[in-house]
């Protein structure tokens, strides 16, 4: 059966300066390939976090993604600013050259409240 990407929250609200968690779970790790988080859709979407590298200031993984059986690809965004508002998508890729997007979560909209 095809892998499913589950983003349980349709939206979250967070005060500027605070942290928020964006939840994402997969139903399978197969086919092998990376998982990435984006803000927005289409050509202009912005890469927010990739589980293949560790250099993303203010964004960290919530679970230990190095567990070989890990299915939790939630992220925490720290020190949220108004510019962080938008809809975030957890996206599963199948390996290739280049990797191919095969499934996206339904998206979680982040609202940033003034402090």
């Amino acid at each position: 059966t095809e892998v499913k990407v589950i983003q349980p929250e349709k939206s979250v609200s967070v005060a500027a300066g605070d942290s928020t968690v964006l939840n994402c779970t997969l139903t399978s790790l197969l086919p092998v390939g990376p998982i990435r988080w984006y803000r927005g859709v289409g050509q202009s979407r912005q890469l927010i976090y990739s589980f293949t590298t560790e250099h993303f200031p203010r964004v960290t993984n919530v679970s230990d993604a190095t567990k070989r059986s890990n299915l939790d690809f939630s992220i925490r965004i720290s020190n949220v600013t108004p510019e962080d508002a938008g809809t975030y998508y957890c996206v599963k890729f199948q390996r290739g050259s280049p990797d191919t997007e095969i499934q996206s979560g339904g998206g979680t909209e982040v609202y940033v409240l003034a402090k």
Epitope: L29, P31, V32, P34, T52, T53, T66, K67, R68, S69
Partner: antibody, heavy 118, light 107 residues
Framework: DVQLVDSGGGVVRPGESLRLSCAAS????????MSWVRQAPGKGLEWLAG????????YYIDSVKGRFTISRDNSKNSLYLQMNSLTAEDTAVYYC???????????WGLGTLVTVSS | ALTQPASVSANPGETVKITCSGG??????YGWYQQKSPGSAPVTVI????KRPSDIPSRFSGSASGSAATLTITGVRVEDEAVYFC???????????FGAGTTLTVL
Amino acid sequence: DVQLVDSGGGVVRPGESLRLSCAASGFTFSSYAMSWVRQAPGKGLEWLAGISAGGSDTYYIDSVKGRFTISRDNSKNSLYLQMNSLTAEDTAVYYCARETWNHLFDYWGLGTLVTVSS
Amino acid sequence: ALTQPASVSANPGETVKITCSGGDYYSTYYGWYQQKSPGSAPVTVIHSDDKRPSDIPSRFSGSASGSAATLTITGVRVEDEAVYFCGAYDGRTYINTFGAGTTLTVL
């Protein structure tokens, strides 16, 4: 620069135990899964065990399950392999290796030689 | 089990291809590891099918398709003489395996 320094090898008798260590530096050790790989004389590479970055999940090849235990101490930037009930077939150079995000290897230790002989 | 040729040879400047078969493209990632002498530390030349570490020369490249992976050395040099092991991680079993190694001789 990433550095992995294996130690703890030596000559032991069959049935005895040995604990190998791997000292890591040059990267955030607590962010990476790690593995042990060995190479018997004149043979190829054989993966033995892996451990998640936090240390809660461990994985073993069947032939060492129950005899070998992989562990880590992130406060000391160190990886360990406890080897019990050693046999002559365990004679090999043992390497620690850092895992990539998809559990392949990008950096290797220099190796430590374990000889099991009566 | 991963299968690779026992040996390959080439003249300096030629292109060498080493294949590794036996994995399942759906569940397996491949890497390539260079060992210049028995018991010396392996060096990763390719991981994640086609990713080259920053300190590895660009003449090394990797690819994967179907049930096989290929290491290509374009413009092989004398210093590339070594044993090359293919390795794989299987996302179904959570297990790593290696091929028996290919001895590259540069004539």
